[in-house]
């Protein structure tokens, strides 16, 4: 048999080998496609099937506009002028080239050593589904699940049967200072069909910058608490990846597991003192917050003591 590839919506003519070019002809076309459950023999006189497959005067079969449901097998059996039976067999596959793929929501820049979403490549209106591939500086990117992660999604339109593909690329650049170029391409996987490429995007990779500032938040505000009360200290830091946070009281490290939150339940006078947190970032070393003062008093009507949380009484200290 012969393999035929036809574009969706385009006409297709299949010739019936051995059939005389003009009547009288002895021929039979039958098909087994998405429109049939078994073999359907077409009437030479024509009929309701003519809208999808019509026998032409020369014995060929015309598919006026091929669709997904027309994929399948077409066979003609003809008797030539010498009385010999000749058979033709076609395997028909259809395809649709989608619109040019696009990278949506592209990143503006990348940060070294951390996961960065580069963007999402979208292709709409393909058949069969095809594949999306990412390229870095013109070379094919092979996802390894660690430094290069690709999340794919394929959807099929309920009416047209055409596919929409989405591919989200996340990378962990190893070093800053570079300007990698990313692009995405769609391939149907058909012979003699070139891939469709997106416009490339060039991104700057920066080193992870120092944290913009550490905020030490204290609850209750002002750091004044009655005996038996609870104090919560939170070290808020805007850095990726989140750094390790250790705690210092009165200049000495507290022997606690690293945590951005320090909880002091049922405080007593022994918990009074000056607290600060230290954030340790892999590429920038330690960074200490401004201190806050915790005081345990019987009455909560005293103003904040010298060296306690700033005069605003907001319970927040920020390092610009």
């Amino acid at each position: 048999g012969q393999n035929i590839t036809a574009r969706i919506g385009e006409p297709l003519v299949l010739s019936c080998k051995g059939a005389p070019k003009k009547p009288p002809q002895q021929l039979e076309w039958k098909l087994n496609t998405g429109r049939t459950e078994a073999w359907k023999v077409l009437s030479p006189q024509g009929g309701p099937w003519d809208s999808v497959a019509r026998i032409l005067p020369n014995g060929s079969l015309l598919l006026p506009a091929t669709g997904i449901v027309d994929e399948g097998t077409f066979r003609c059996r003809a008797t030539n002028r010498r009385g010999k039976e000749v058979k033709s067999n076609y395997r028909v596959r259809v395809y649709q080239i989608p619109g040019k793929p696009e990278i949506v929501d592209p990143a503006s820049e990348l940060t070294a050593s951390v996961p960065n979403k580069v963007g999402t490549c979208v292709s709409e209106g393909s058949y069969p589904a095809g594949t999306l591939s990412w390229h870095l500086d013109g070379k094919l990117l092979i996802p390894d699940g660690k430094e290069t992660l690709v999340k794919e999604e394929t959807r099929r339109h309920p009416e047209t049967g055409l596919f929409t593909l989405r591919s989200e690329l996340t990378v962990i650049p190893t070093q800053g200072g570079t300007h990698p170029t990313f692009s995405c391409s769609f391939s149907l996987g058909l012979p003699r069909r070139r891939p469709l490429n997106t416009a490339p995007i060039q991104l700057r990779v920066r080193e992870p910058g120092p944290p913009e500032g550490i905020q030490l938040l204290v609850e209750p505000e002002g750091g004044i608490v009655a005996p038996g009360g609870t104090v919560t200290l939170t070290c808020a830091i805007s850095a990726q990846p989140p750094p390790q946070v250790h705690w210092i009281k009165d200049g000495a490290p507290l022997p606690l597991a690293p945590s951005p939150v320090l909880l002091l339940p049922e405080v007593g006078h022994e918990d009074e003192g000056t607290y600060s947190c230290v954030a340790t970032h892999p590429s920038h070393g330690p960074q200490e917050s401004p201190p806050v003062s915790i005081r345990v008093t019987e009455t909560g009507d005293e103003g904040p003591a010298e060296g306690s949380v700033g005069e605003s009484g907001l319970g927040t200290l920020a390092l610009a």
Partner: antibody, heavy 119, light 107 residues
Framework: EVQLVESGGGLVQPGGSLRLSCAAS????????MTWVRQAPGKGLEWVAS????????YYPDSVKDRFTISRDNAKNSLYLQMNSLRAEDTAVYYC????????????WGQGTLVTVSS | DIQMTQSPSSLSASVGDRVTITCRAS??????VNWFQQKPGKAPRRLIY???NLADGVPSRFSGSRSGTDFTLTISSLQPEDFATYYC?????????FGGGTKVEIK
């Protein structure tokens, strides 16, 4: 909204001729096959003629072949049935219907026009 | 030519009844069968297309099924507005053939 409106029915003598029209609106007329179906008084439905969307191919049952001609004017969104050599048994309500091929069957029908063949 | 043998030709039923109408094709017509409802003095209205698919705007109490060359229209719970005549149609081959019709009357 799809609308099919038939006209041209009436009383005609046996052997006479009549031309029915069907005005279509609310859809892209030249995308569809069109069909005439008839119903004799108190009887069932009978297929009369079909035409493909281009108008190049027409189809009839033996009962009307060589007497009836279906045609269409895609520019005017109109379907026609030319009926010649009319017989008493052609008396029926004639319906215009959208479709007639395997993709549609008949999905929309007009309200019909009555043709009476009698002397 | 294909014959579509529809049965019964008439039936009496009450509101709420389950009603089944059958058409048998004399040869394989695939899925290419429609069902229509017709009320006196009105044009037919398509209920089911391609044997099993409910047409737009048709209540879900109507359903179509197929077993080989046997096609069935079922009304799960008959409503007062369902008293009418029902026809099947094969549109797989010319001449296109309708069943003889089934008149559903009030018991």
């Amino acid at each position: 909204e799809v609308q099919l409106v038939e006209s041209g029915g009436g009383l005609v003598q046996p052997g006479g001729s009549l031309r029915l029209s069907c005005a279509a609106s609310g859809f892209t007329f030249n995308n569809y096959w069109m069909t005439w179906v008839r119903q004799a008084p108190g009887k069932g439905l009978e297929w009369v003629a079909s035409i493909d969307n281009s108008g190049d191919n027409t189809y009839y049952p033996d009962s009307v072949k060589d007497r009836f001609t279906i045609s269409r004017d895609n520019a005017k969104n109109s379907l026609y049935l030319q009926m010649n050599s009319l017989r008493a048994e052609d008396t029926a309500v004639y319906y215009c219907a959208r479709g007639g091929d395997i993709t549609t069957g008949f999905d929309y029908w007009g309200q019909g026009t009555l043709v009476t063949v009698s002397s | 030519d294909i014959q579509m043998t529809q049965s019964p030709s008439s039936l009496s039923a009450s509101v709420g009844d389950r009603v089944t109408i059958t058409c048998r094709a004399s040869q394989d017509v695939g899925i290419y069968v429609n069902w229509f409802q017709q009320k006196p003095g009105k044009a037919p209205r398509r209920l089911i297309y391609r044997a099993t698919n409910l047409a737009d705007g048709v209540p879900s109490r109507f359903s179509g099924s197929r077993s080989g060359t046997d096609f069935t229209l079922t009304i799960s719970s008959l409503q007062p507005e369902d008293f009418a005549t029902y026809y099947c149609l094969e549109f797989d081959e010319h001449p296109l053939t309708f069943g003889g019709g089934t008149k559903v009357e009030i018991k």
